[in-house]
Amino acid sequence: FERTRSLQDPCSNCPAGTFCDNNRNQICSPCPPNSFSSAGGQRTCDICRQCKGVFRTRKECSSTSNAECDCTPGFHCLGAGCSMCEQDCKQGQELTKKGCKDCCFGTFNDQKRGICRPWTNCSLDGKSVLVNGTKERDVVCGPSPADLSPGASSVTPPAPAREPGHSPQ
């Protein structure tokens, strides 16, 4: 049935970039300026997206494809097809309702977007802090305190007594 209908429907012959004009005996007419049709057989053309204000044009609209927008410097895209532009912050900051705020102590953000995240807790992996964290950078974990040097055992609790010949795990 679908195939039969498409043979009888003159609109199915209208290619992308045109529309089937009912006012002109279903002739395929080109999309008017600032509009497009990305598929064939369309009865109308869609209005081109306008990249206004904080949005800038990444790709111009053509008769067969919509315009694509991105954000002006200082902002980044959010959402499908860059439906929103969100303010950038500096590294070491996060965006709040009241603008960019520095990361609290113990947290960091190494990007211009997103939220401040807690520093890695090296001790959870049995490691020590090799390089302290900052607002912009996470801590760097090093080897476990016991592996650092022979003298390091003084800062770690004594290991339980073991049979001779057994090394610590």
Epitope: K52, G53, F55, M84, E86, Q87, K98
Partner: nanobody, 121 residues
């Protein structure tokens, strides 16, 4: 008809002042933040300033801090950008937009067409 309209642009000498207006019609400006942007010939569009709807707190680009002041008169449905100590590098088309929030703009926000500011001796 819902629209934003900028006015107040013109030619001014370096060191001079101008006050731009961003007037809304067809909607209540008091519900929206207002952001100001500018675009100089051959340059990227640049964020200038924004004023929040809730508490009228204002934010400024480093390049205009201390020289530009943004304010709002919700009764007149208008936001103002007072520009002082103008420099030739302030020459641009200035436009305003009405997001819900200074930090986030949507593709369906209202925008004006812009007003030309030229700073030259």
């Amino acid at each position: 008809q819902v629209q934003l309209q900028e006015s107040g642009g013109g030619l001014v000498q370096p060191g001079g002042s101008l006050r731009l207006s961003c007037a809304a019609s067809g909607f209540s400006l008091g519900l929206y933040a207002i952001g100001w942007f500018r675009q100089a010939p051959g340059k990227e569009r640049e964020w200038v300033s924004c004023i929040m709807s809730s508490d009228s707190s204002a934010y400024y680009a480093d390049s205009v801090k201390g020289r530009f002041t943004v304010s709002r008169d919700n009764a007149k449905n208008t936001v103002y950008l007072q520009m002082t100590n103008l420099k030739p590098e302030d020459t641009a088309v200035y436009l305003c937009g009405a997001p819900r929030d200074c930090s986030r703009y949507s593709s369906d926000d209202y925008w004006g067409q812009g007003t030309q500011v030229t700073v030259s001796s």
